[in-house]
């Protein structure tokens, strides 16, 4: 996949000491709406990698047809390959399902590059390594696509976990998670632990390795350390949040915080990179370059195009700064920060140089549609999508890649005033345009 773009579409100091487990203040919150504790059956149910997406096994139809489905918090359709395609090992065969119902309606989803189109229907769906339930859900049977499926990614469909407002063809098409919550006793919450390997994986290694966990209906304590800190979901369409401050190695970027959220900031597992609005990207890169100025890297590296390679095991992580995003907290005038390491924003790339080398792409890129906290951010954290309480929680992931000197961190509280002013209000007229151009 290219750097930092919507995943299915194409290929955007100062942490707590290692091993420190902070007290979990949040454990004392009421248990509802999401069950807490152990979800053994769901742990390690994801495979994949940031560059090609993380997928979960699902079954569709009667008798059940097994498919690997990309977990995407940046869209709201459940859509699966339903016709032969050179990049698909298998696809949904509606004619073989006795429980398939045709909705006699088409759906067309164009992206900035590429598209998919298909036919809408419903069928019985379950997640083998998820809650022990079966639901009737809307399914878009993809019959035609361009630059959507990824060669070698091993997934055949996409599970859009965002809200109905951005569902296609319109918000009347109930997303899968809404159907799941409505039809079962599963609490209205899910959590994601995406585990970046820290080194490139070839296809067979991806198939054999664990990519992380999607806990449906709850929070698993074993997947994080320290405390969970929550930020409000600003609006239920994408998982929109508000960034109030950005620091590079503790140095404030000192921009008007509206710039950080222009025109929105979202948490999106279906995007590879941390994508930043143009002005913010330029300031961030300038600051990262300054922090690592003992070295000079090619222009194409900062564009996410050229790879930089070091002798295996000698990547100078210490010359690259940590990046902190401060998010609006749940309490007035209170924020918290999430801090990622270069181990998250330098993405290991498969064997392009020699086996003696470790090669990386810069996984921060420019966006014209706001900030996207993609897989490279999420790989540092256990992320709780608490839909019931309209909030997103972050804690340090138990599987994040770090070194002996620095670790990813989630820290707070910090006093931040006028955080509401950091949100950007999208003019109503622009919205329909934005919806079709998801770069």
């Amino acid at each position: 996949t290219q750097h930092g773009i919507r995943l299915p579409l194409r290929s955007g100091l100062g942490g707590a000491p290692l091993g420190l487990r902070l007290p979990r203040e949040t454990d004392e919150e009421p248990e509802e709406p999401g069950r807490r504790g152990s979800f053994v059956e769901m742990v390690d149910n994801l495979r994949g990698k940031s560059g090609q997406g993380y997928y979960v096994e699902m079954t569709v139809g009667s008798p059940p047809q097994t498919l690997n489905i990309l977990v995407d918090t940046g869209s709201s359709n459940f859509a699966v390959g339903a016709a032969p395609h050179p990049f698909l090992h298998r696809y949904y065969q509606r004619q073989l399902s006795s429980t398939y119902r045709d909705l006699r309606k088409g759906v067309y989803v164009p992206y900035t590059q590429g598209k998919w189109e298909g036919e809408l229907g419903t069928d019985l769906v379950s997640i083998p390594h998820g809650p022990n339930v079966t639901v009737r859900a809307n399914i878009a049977a993809i019959t035609e696509s361009d630059k959507f499926f990824i060669n070698g990614s091993n997934w055949e469909g996409i599970l859009g976990l965002a809200y109905a407002e951005i569902a296609r063809p319109d918000d009347s098409l109930e997303p899968f998670f809404d159907s799941l919550v409505k039809q079962t006793h599963v609490p209205n919450l899910f959590s994601l632990q995406l585990c970046g390997a820290g080194f490139p994986l070839n296809q067979s290694e991806v198939l054999a390795s664990v990519g992380g966990s999607m806990i449906i209906g709850g929070i698993d304590h074993s997947l994080y350390t320290g405390s969970l800190w929550y930020t409000p979901i600003r609006r239920e369409w994408y998982y929109e949040v508000i960034i109030v401050r950005v620091e590079i190695n503790g140095q404030d970027l000192k921009m008007d915080c509206k710039e950080y959220n222009y025109d929105k900031s979202i948490v999106d597992s279906g995007t590879t990179n941390l994508r930043l609005p143009k002005k913010v990207f330029e300031a961030a890169v300038k600051s990262i370059k300054a922090a690592s100025s003992t070295e000079k890297f090619p222009d194409g590296f900062w564009l996410g195009e050229q790879l930089v390679c070091w002798q295996a095991g000698t990547t100078p992580w210490n010359i690259f700064p940590v990046i902190s995003l401060y998010l609006m907290g749940e309490v007035t005038n209170q924020s918290f920060r999430i801090t990622i390491l270069p181990q998250q924003y330098l993405r290991p790339v498969e064997d392009v140089a020699t086996s003696q080398d470790d090669c990386y792409k810069f996984a921060i890129s420019q966006s014209s549609t706001g900030t996207v906290m993609g897989a490279v951010i999420m790989e540092g954290f256990y992320v709780v999508f608490d839909r019931a309480r309209k909030r997103i929680g972050f804690a340090v992931s138990a599987c994040h890649v770090h070194d002996e000197f620095r670790t990813a961190a989630v820290e707070g509280p910090f006093v931040t005033l006028d955080m509401e002013d950091c949100g950007y209000n999208i003019p109503q007229t622009d919205e329909s345009t934005l919806m079709t151009g998801r770069a």
Partner: antibody
């Protein structure tokens, strides 16, 4: 205009250390826009990248030569140098110094080259 | 490791003719490819960078094209001074260490 000139002995004995210097004139080696590199070409053969250095002293080496190569910079003299230890006849080549420009990716300016023969 | 294969090894042409040189990468290098010209007894000279951009002072008869794995250097009408060896180099993986084996353009 900027020019590069290699200098050093043309004959080195096997097992000894080859030492070359590249003098940069008409511009500063301390420019933040460039790396400074060494490339060699055995007689009748193709080009082989040896390594390069930034004015800060940061170095990058060809993995196949890494254990034997040292590149250093002297900003006060506007020079950078190559040392290749434990040489054999296979190290006989024309050695070029070059500037790495165009987004520090391409060798956009070369010295004339100097032939170094390894022989007893 | 990315390997660059140049073809043909030798190209025999007359002045005024069009020369087409090929460089194939073992995997995609995007547009991060350069072409160099080397005349006998001289140092190489950068002709084309980023697959299609002419370096300073390079005549318009030299053009580069391609992206991904297949690249072409075209000399629209050979001048006597163009008979030389041409090398391609990829910098998709950096540092810039991979050169092709070269194509010799000789007078027919």
């Amino acid at each position: 205009q900027l020019q590069l000139q290699e200098s050093g002995p043309g004959l080195v004995k096997p097992s000894e250390t080859l030492s070359l210097t590249c003098t940069v004139s008409g511009g500063s080696i301390s420019s933040s826009s460039y790396y400074w590199g060494w490339i060699r070409q055995p007689p009748g053969k193709g080009l082989e990248w040896i390594g390069m250095i930034y004015y800060s002293g940061s170095t990058w080496y060809n993995p196949s030569l890494r254990s034997r190569v040292t590149i250093s910079v002297d900003t006060s003299k506007n020079q950078f140098s190559l040392k290749l230890s434990s040489v054999t006849a296979a190290d006989t080549a024309v050695y070029y110094c070059a500037r790495v420009g165009h987004g520090v990716s391409y060798f956009d300016l070369w010295g004339r080259g100097t032939l170094v023969t390894v022989s007893s | 490791e990315i390997v660059l294969t140049q073809s043909p090894a030798t190209l025999s042409l007359s002045p005024g003719e069009r020369a087409t040189l090929s460089c194939r990468a073992s995997q995609s290098v995007s547009s991060y490819l350069a072409w160099y010209q080397q005349k006998p007894g001289q140092a190489p000279r950068l002709l084309i960078y980023d697959a299609s951009k002419r370096a300073t002072g390079i005549p318009a008869r030299f053009s580069g094209s391609g992206s991904g794995t297949d690249f072409t250097l075209t000399i629209s009408s050979l001048e006597p001074e163009d008979f030389a060896v041409y090398y391609c180099q990829q910098v998709y993986t950096w540092p810039p260490r991979t050169f092709g084996g070269g194509t010799k353009v000789e007078i027919k």
